[in-house]
């Protein structure tokens, strides 16, 4: 014999008090699958948590974090404090990245600058606490007569001095 509750769609529950008919989920509750005997209470996004998606009869509310914080954990169960770019969050709070490391985001850890020489390249732009180094052409490409890097100066007619 088929369970009559299996016919109850998402957004409803199988109401045992009413001969197992399908009743809509009450306000502030939801059921995301069919055949449910109860509806789940909607999550409320309070305090540091802001509503990203409202609860509906078939899906729970989704929260994110107020500015100055970012989500951690499954479904944004926690909000972690942001730091500034060029910092990382340690057990003693936000600390500047050590020399040779950078962080270009408000979260996460400081990462070492790219070692350009490992790729046979030179440093084109130095790194900072907020930005990685920019690697340029290999040192060999920068040697005199390497036309791929510095185009030759246009030939001048004899007797003309530079402008």
């Amino acid at each position: 014999l088929q369970d009559p509750c299996s016919n109850c769609p998402a957004g409803t529950f199988c109401d045992n008090n009413r001969n197992q008919i399908c009743s809509p989920c009450p306000p502030n509750s939801f059921s995301s699958a069919g055949g449910q005997r109860t509806c789940d209470i909607c999550r409320q996004c309070k305090g540091v948590f802001r509503t990203r998606k409202e609860c509906s009869s078939t899906s729970n509310a989704e929260c994110d974090c107020t500015p100055g914080f970012h989500c951690l954990g499954a479904g944004c169960s926690m909000c972690e404090q942001d730091c500034k770019q060029g910092q990382e969050l340690t057990k003693k709070g936000c600390k500047d990245c050590c020399f040779g490391t950078f962080n270009d985001q408000k979260r996460g850890i400081c990462r070492p600058w790219t070692n350009c020489s490992l790729d046979g390249k030179s440093v084109l732009v130095n790194g900072t606490k907020e930005r990685d180094v920019v690697c340029g052409p290999s040192p060999a490409d920068l040697s005199p007569g390497a036309s791929s890097v510095t185009p030759p100066a246009p030939a001048r007619e004899p007797g003309h001095s530079p402008q």
Epitope: S77, E80, Q81, K92
Partner: nanobody, 124 residues
Framework: QVQLVESGGGLVQPGGSLRLSCSAS????????MSWVRQAPGKGLEWVSD????????FYEDSVKGRFTISRDNAKNTLYLQMNSLRAEDTAVYYC?????????????????WGQGTLVTVFP
């Protein structure tokens, strides 16, 4: 071991004020967000307010906004709740609670340590 001890509760008339304190020990107080939660007679737990580790970010339940102020003194390892314009519906046991991760604000289900509570009774 972690200890949270609330004080400052008592009897007060509607419109009156109270200041609750929560003395913390057994952990690096200045690294953790803290909360106040209350439980009215015969009701479930209700989140009241959060404060981040440094004290510069505070958050309140709508019904207490503008009346309650959460603060902390990290040098004294103490959390406070200043309660003004008290109403009968503020009658409850007030608990302070610690958040589980440093520099992080969690939902009430995840608080890892709670005090024993202090009773606030607002009576006409």
């Amino acid at each position: 071991q972690v200890q949270l001890v609330e004080s400052g509760g008592g009897l007060v008339q509607p419109g009156g004020s109270l200041r609750l304190s929560c003395s913390a020990s057994g952990f690096t107080f200045s690294s953790y967000a803290m909360s106040w939660v209350r439980q009215a007679p015969g009701k479930g737990l209700e989140w009241v307010s959060d404060i981040n580790s440094g004290g510069e970010s505070t958050f309140y339940e709508d019904s207490v906004k503008g009346r309650f102020t959460i603060s902390r003194d990290n040098a004294k390892n103490t959390l406070y709740l200043q309660m003004n314009s008290l109403r009968a519906e503020d009658t409850a046991v007030y608990y302070c609670a610690k958040h589980p991760l440093t520099y992080t604000i969690a939902t009430m289900n995840d608080y890892d340590y709670w005090g024993q509570g202090t009773l606030v009774t607002v009576f006409p």
